[in-house]
């Protein structure tokens, strides 16, 4: 079977500062030199793109400056960090990997990571 398998953790809890990190690992059926990684959010049956980056194997993963994602790559493993999350952003985050070059193209879609985000309690007013 020449399909590409993508693995990611089932559940991640965001930090109190709204930061969530997880590893997206793919089993490459070919020797790709150019890879595109996309983080998708699935809510009900709607899928939206959170962020995307294309990188050359051996080089760093670079998201756009205004992206809420950062990441590093090592071999067939990508360490993804999503920032600025709030409770309303709780949901299923899917890692999508595409082997763009050289041919053939391969698509790999993970089962998704359920990210739970809990907004921090506001600090109580204190008297000095």
């Amino acid at each position: 079977c020449k399909a590409m398998h993508v693995a990611q953790p089932a559940v991640v809890l965001a930090s109190s500062r709204g930061i969530a990190s997880f590893v997206c690992e793919y089993a490459s059926p070919g020797k790709a030199t150019e890879v595109r990684v996309t983080v998708l959010r699935q809510a009900d049956s709607q899928v939206t793109e959170v962020c995307a980056a294309t990188y050359m194997m051996g080089n760093e993963l670079t998201f756009l400056d205004d992206s809420i994602c950062t990441g590093t790559s090592s071999g067939n493993q990508v360490n993804l960090t999503i920032q600025g999350l709030r409770a309303m952003d709780t949901g299923l985050y899917i890692c999508k990997v595409e082997l763009m070059y050289p041919p053939p193209y391969y698509l790999g879609i993970g089962n998704g990571t359920q990210i739970y985000v809990i907004d921090p309690e506001p600090c109580p007013d204190s008297d000095f």
Partner: antibody
Framework: QVQLVESGGGVVQPGRSLRLSCAAS????????MHWVRQAPGKGLEWVAV????????YYADPVKGRFTISRDNSKNTLYLQMNSLRDEDTAVYYC???????????WGQGTMVTVSS | EIVLTQSPGTLSLSPGERATLSCRAS???????LAWYQQKPGQAPRLLIY???SRATGIPDRFSGSGSGTDFTLTISRLEPEDFAVYYC?????????FGQGTKVEIK
């Protein structure tokens, strides 16, 4: 609403050229891979070509390789298919289709007919 | 190249009956990358099922998909008059993208 509209089809002689266009609206065009799929009269669907995101990566079906060129202009939200050295067997309805985030072709244009005949 | 073979070529059924369409792949296809499309005469194809079993937006629940490996099935539980059409399976996990030859569901 999300829409794809093809244009540029017509009747052309063998060996001549034709350029098809596909105007996209209602979505962020540059975030999607875009395909051309064709259907000869009374036949099934045949994938023709794909172009990804920024337009650098393209793939073609063997029967059209070296003759057809797929391109896109993200500033104009438009997909193109330049067809050269046309053959009788290229006669078909040509559809542009969007590759959805999960890979399947979720949005299709209405199609444009290309007839290659002397 | 992954070759998809659909059967039967034509299915003659009456409204209200159950339709079972088959799609067989020449090599194993991950179920994440198998889709079904419906096409009516003079119209563009319409996505019904993606990921072998997930219904696309707006598709009624009488349509369901199943299968894994090399064998996939599209089931229409109770045929409505508007369901008589040609159905295509497709794999989109690797290039080249390929379609089955189609199954025509016609009124008996």
């Amino acid at each position: 609403q999300v829409q794809l509209v093809e244009s540029g089809g017509g009747v052309v002689q063998p060996g001549r050229s034709l350029r098809l266009s596909c105007a996209a609206s209602g979505f962020t065009f540059s975030s999607y891979g875009m395909h051309w799929v064709r259907q000869a009269p009374g036949k099934g669907l045949e994938w023709v070509a794909v172009i990804w995101y920024d337009g650098r990566n393209k793939y073609y079906a063997d029967p059209v390789k070296g003759r057809f060129t797929i391109s896109r202009d993200n500033s104009k939200n438009t997909l193109y298919l330049q067809m050269n050295s046309l053959r009788d067997e290229d006669t078909a309805v040509y559809y542009c289709a969007r590759a959805g985030y999960l890979g399947a072709f979720d949005i299709w244009g209405q199609g444009t007919m290309v007839t290659v005949s002397s | 190249e992954i070759v998809l073979t659909q059967s039967p070529g034509t299915l003659s059924l009456s409204p209200g009956e159950r339709a079972t369409l088959s799609c067989r792949a020449s090599q194993s296809v991950s179920s994440s990358y198998l889709a079904w499309y419906q096409q009516k005469p003079g119209q563009a194809p319409r996505l019904l099922i993606y990921g072998a079993s997930s219904r696309a937006t707006g598709i009624p629940d009488r349509f369901s998909g199943s299968g894994s490996g090399t064998d996939f099935t599209l089931t229409i539980s109770r045929l409505e008059p508007e369901d008589f059409a040609v159905y295509y399976c497709q794999q989109y996990g690797s290039s080249p993208w390929t379609f089955g030859q189609g199954t025509k569901v016609e009124i008996k």
